[in-house]
C-alpha cells in the first residue's frame, strides 16, 4: 500500500433521515464488488487517508424511474459531491441535476487531503436505486 | 508490459443478430484511435488477461437520434456492461437507460480476473451510432 | 515529474466570440481546485507536453438551464472534444449532445502526442455554466 494506490468503490447502503440529504455508502467484498483499499468509511461517508490528486466518480440512478418521474416534481433532483469535513475545507466538487433523466454519471480530478470526508448529497424527494450496477461512488488516487 | 498497465479502448464494429443484444467491438491503430494493450477481443467481446482492479468506461450514442427518438418506443433502451463469461462470474457491472436522451456515458472501478469476458448489452430496438467519437468502450488496469 | 504523471483539471474561463465555438479554460491553485501539472494552456486551450495514452474527461452544464431550455432551440447544443492542432492530427475525440438535458459528462482513453492542442467546441447558442463544480475539463496521462 506504500505506493499510494488508495482506491475505493462503494455501493449505496441507505439514504439519510428526512432533513439529511446525504447518501450513506458501504463497501467490502462480502457485499459484492465494492471495496476500500486505503480510504475508509465513517458513518457511511468516505474519508481520505492519503494526500494526492484523486479521480472521483459517481453514478446515481433514481429508483423505479421513467422519463416523467423527474418532471413530476416541483423541486429539481440534484446530486452534489463535496468535501463536507473538515469544515474549513468544505466545498462542492461535482454537481449534476436529473433533468427528465433517471441517471447521472460523472467524474473529475481533484486534490484531496488526508482527513477529507466526502459527502454525496441528493436533494429532492426521489429515492435512489440501491442496485449495485446502477448506483455507485468511488475514488482513485492518481498522483501525489 | 510487466508493469500490468493493461489498457484497451474499443470502437463499435456492429450489433448482433436480432436475439443477441450484445454490441460487437473492434480495436487497433489501423481502425483509428482504438487500441488493445493486454486485453484481447474474442468474437467482438473484450477478454481480460490480467487480474486487478480496472476502471471500466463506456459511452453509447443512439444513431440519428433526437430527444423524441427514445420516447417513440414502448420498450426502454438500456445499456448494461457485465461479465458474461465464465458463467460462474456472470454479473452486471454497470447499467444505464436512455430516458429521452440519446447518449449514456459512465465509468466505474471493478475487480476483474484473467479470463473474464465483458459484454455490453443494448436492449431495445434502436441502433447505436458507429461514429468513433460517439460510441466507445474501454478498460484500464489501475492496481492489483 | 519524470514518471510522466502529466495531469490537468481545468475550469471554464469564458466562451469565445460569436463565430468561435471553443470554450476557453483556465487552471491553477489560485483559481480554486484546478491545476496543470505537465500540460499547459495556450490561449485557453490545453496543450499536451508528453506522448502517451490519456484519460480525457469533461463535464459541461448549461447556465440557468431547465429541461425545456435545450428543447426551445432549433439547433441542437453539442459538445465536441478534439485535437484542433496541429492540423494534420485534427480529429474529434468525444462528442455529446444535450437532448432535453442540461449537463453532459463523459470520458475516454485516447493516444495523444506532445504538441497536440485539445479544443472543446460548444455549438448552439446556450451559455455554459462557469461554476467550478458544474463545468470542468481534464486529462490524465495513464501509460506510454
Amino acid at each position: 500500500e506504500s505506493l499510494g494506490w488508495d482506491i475505493a468503490e462503494l455501493q449505496l447502503n441507505h439514504t439519510g433521515p428526512q432533513q439529511d440529504p446525504r447518501l450513506y455508502w458501504q463497501g467490502g467484498p462480502a457485499l459484492g464488488r465494492s471495496f476500500l483499499r486505503g480510504p475508509e468509511l465513517d458513518k457511511g461517508q468516505l474519508r481520505i487517508r492519503r494526500d494526492g490528486i484523486y479521480m472521483v466518480h459517481i453514478q446515481v440512478t433514481l429508483a423505479i424511474c421513467s422519463s416523467t418521474s423527474t418532471s413530476r416534481h416541483h423541486h429539481p433532483t440534484t446530486l452534489a459531491v463535496g468535501i463536507c469535513s473538515p469544515a474549513s475545507r468544505s466545498i462542492s466538487l461535482l454537481r449534476l441535476s436529473f433533468h427528465q433523466g433517471c441517471t447521472i454519471a460523472s467524474q473529475r480530478l481533484t486534490p484531496l487531503a488526508r482527513g477529507d470526508t466526502l459527502c454525496t448529497n441528493l436533494t429532492g424527494t426521489l429515492l435512489p436505486s440501491r442496485n449495485t450496477d446502477e448506483t455507485f461512488f468511488g475514488v482513485q488516487w492518481v498522483r501525489p | 508490459e510487466s508493469l500490468g498497465w493493461d489498457i484497451a479502448e474499443l470502437q463499435l464494429n456492429h450489433t448482433g443478430p436480432q436475439q443477441d443484444p450484445r454490441l460487437y467491438w473492434q480495436g487497433g491503430p489501423a481502425l483509428g484511435r482504438s487500441f488493445l494493450r493486454g486485453p484481447e477481443l474474442d468474437k467482438g467481446q473484450l477478454r481480460i488477461r490480467r487480474d486487478g482492479i480496472y476502471m471500466v468506461h463506456i459511452q453509447v450514442t443512439l444513431a440519428i437520434c433526437s430527444s423524441t427518438s427514445t420516447s417513440r418506443h414502448h420498450h426502454p433502451t438500456t445499456l448494461a456492461v457485465g461479465i458474461c463469461s465464465p458463467a460462474s462470474r456472470s454479473i452486471s457491472l454497470l447499467r444505464l437507460s436512455f430516458h429521452q436522451g440519446c447518449t449514456i456515458a459512465s465509468q466505474r472501478l471493478t475487480p476483474l480476473a484473467r479470463g473474464d469476458t465483458l459484454c455490453t448489452n443494448l436492449t431495445g430496438t434502436l441502433l447505436p451510432s458507429r461514429n468513433t467519437d460517439e460510441t466507445f468502450f474501454g478498460v484500464q488496469w489501475v492496481r492489483p | 515529474e519524470s514518471l510522466g504523471w502529466d495531469i490537468a483539471e481545468l475550469q471554464l474561463n469564458h466562451t469565445g466570440p460569436q463565430q468561435d465555438p471553443r470554450l476557453y479554460w483556465q487552471g491553477g491553485p489560485a483559481l480554486g481546485r484546478s491545476f496543470l501539472r505537465g500540460p499547459e494552456l495556450d490561449k485557453g486551450q490545453l496543450r499536451i507536453r508528453r506522448d502517451g495514452i490519456y484519460m480525457v474527461h469533461i463535464q459541461v452544464t448549461l447556465a440557468i438551464c431547465s429541461s425545456t431550455s435545450t428543447s426551445r432551440h432549433h439547433h441542437p447544443t453539442t459538445l465536441a472534444v478534439g485535437i484542433c492542432s496541429p492540423a494534420s492530427r485534427s480529429i474529434s475525440l468525444l462528442r455529446l449532445s444535450f437532448h432535453q438535458g442540461c449537463t453532459i459528462a463523459s470520458q475516454r482513453l485516447t493516444p495523444l502526442a506532445r504538441g497536440d492542442t485539445l479544443c472543446t467546441n460548444l455549438t448552439g447558442t446556450l451559455l455554459p455554466s462557469r461554476n467550478t463544480d458544474e463545468t470542468f475539463f481534464g486529462v490524465q496521462w495513464v501509460r506510454p
Partner: antibody
Framework: QVQLKQSGPGLVQPSQSLSITCTVS????????VHWVRQSPGKGLEWLGV???????DYNAPFISRLSITKDNSKSQVFFKMNSLQADDTAIYYC??????????????WGQGTSVTVSS | DIVLTQSPASLAVSLGQRATISCRAN??????????MHWYQQKPGQPPKLLIY???NLASGVPARFSGSGSGTDFTLNIHPVEGEDAATYYC?????????FGAGTKLELK
C-alpha cells in the same frame, strides 16, 4: 408468420375522409412501428406517416393537418384516417411494418394495399 | 426534403446478365456511422418488398444475386445473374431524416 391485412373503402367522395384499418399478426404493435405509404402514378411512392410502439406518431409535413394514425394494441390494429380528400389523393394506400431496428426506418413487411379512388 | 433520383427509368437485360440501377441523393444520407439507403422490389399488383437495407445488407430471404453498394450520395443496386422472376420495378428509399422519401423507380424488363 408476419402479416398485415388492410380493410377500407375503394371509393371516397371529394372532401370526405378516408379510413383504413391495418390488422397485423405475427408480431406485436408494442414492439414494432407501422408506416403508411401511398402510391400513385403521378407521385410514385409517398411516405405519409408512422405510429411507433409507444403510440407516438410522426407525419410527413404536408399531411399533418388532415392525417391521423392511431392504434389498438390489444386488437393488433392500426387505424389510418385522412380528411378532406381530393382527386389527387387517388392512390393505393399501404401499411408497412418498421424494421426491427426502431431508428432504421426501413419497411420489411407490407400490407396488400387499399386502392382508393376519389370521385363523385 | 431529400430527393432521390433513379436512373435509368427503365432497362432491359438478358437472362444471366447484370442489371445495374443507380440512385442519387441530393444530399448525404450518411449519419452515425451508417448510410441510410434501402432498396425495394415491386412486382405488378403486389406491394413493395424490402430487398436491401443500409446500402448492402440483404433482407431476410433475398437471394445473393442482389447486391448493393455506394456511399454518401451515390448508390447502386446490382442483380447478377438476372433471372426471370427479377422483372419488376425497383425503388430506393432513404431514412436519414423525416420525411422518408423514395426514388421514382426503375423498371427492369427481360430481353
Amino acid at each position: 408468420q408476419v402479416q398485415l391485412k388492410q380493410s377500407g373503402p375503394g371509393l371516397v367522395q371529394p372532401s370526405q375522409s378516408l379510413s383504413i384499418t391495418c390488422t397485423v399478426s405475427g408480431f406485436s404493435l408494442t414492439t414494432y412501428g407501422v408506416h403508411w405509404v401511398r402510391q400513385s402514378p403521378g407521385k410514385g411512392l409517398e411516405w405519409l406517416g408512422v405510429i411507433w410502439s409507444a403510440g407516438i406518431t410522426d407525419y410527413n409535413a404536408p399531411f399533418i393537418s388532415r392525417l391521423s394514425i392511431t392504434k389498438d394494441n390489444s386488437k393488433s390494429q392500426v387505424f389510418f384516417k385522412m380528411n378532406s380528400l381530393q382527386a389527387d389523393d387517388t392512390a393505393i394506400y399501404y401499411c408497412a411494418r418498421n424494421d426491427y431496428y426502431g431508428n432504421l426506418y426501413a419497411m420489411d413487411y407490407w400490407g396488400q394495399g387499399t386502392s382508393v379512388t376519389v370521385s363523385s | 426534403d431529400i430527393v432521390l433520383t433513379q436512373s435509368p427509368a427503365s432497362l432491359a437485360v438478358s437472362l444471366g446478365q447484370r442489371a445495374t440501377i443507380s440512385c442519387r441523393a441530393n444530399k448525404s444520407v450518411s449519419a452515425s456511422g451508417y448510410t441510410f439507403m434501402h432498396w425495394y422490389q415491386q412486382k405488378p399488383g403486389q406491394p413493395p418488398k424490402l430487398l436491401i437495407y443500409l446500402v448492402s445488407n440483404l433482407a431476410s430471404g433475398v437471394p445473393a444475386r442482389f447486391s448493393g453498394s455506394g456511399s454518401g450520395t451515390d448508390f447502386t443496386l446490382n442483380i447478377h445473374p438476372v433471372e426471370g422472376e427479377d422483372a419488376a420495378t425497383y425503388y430506393c428509399q432513404h431514412s436519414r431524416e423525416f420525411p422518408l422519401t423514395f426514388g421514382a423507380g426503375t423498371k427492369l424488363e427481360l430481353k
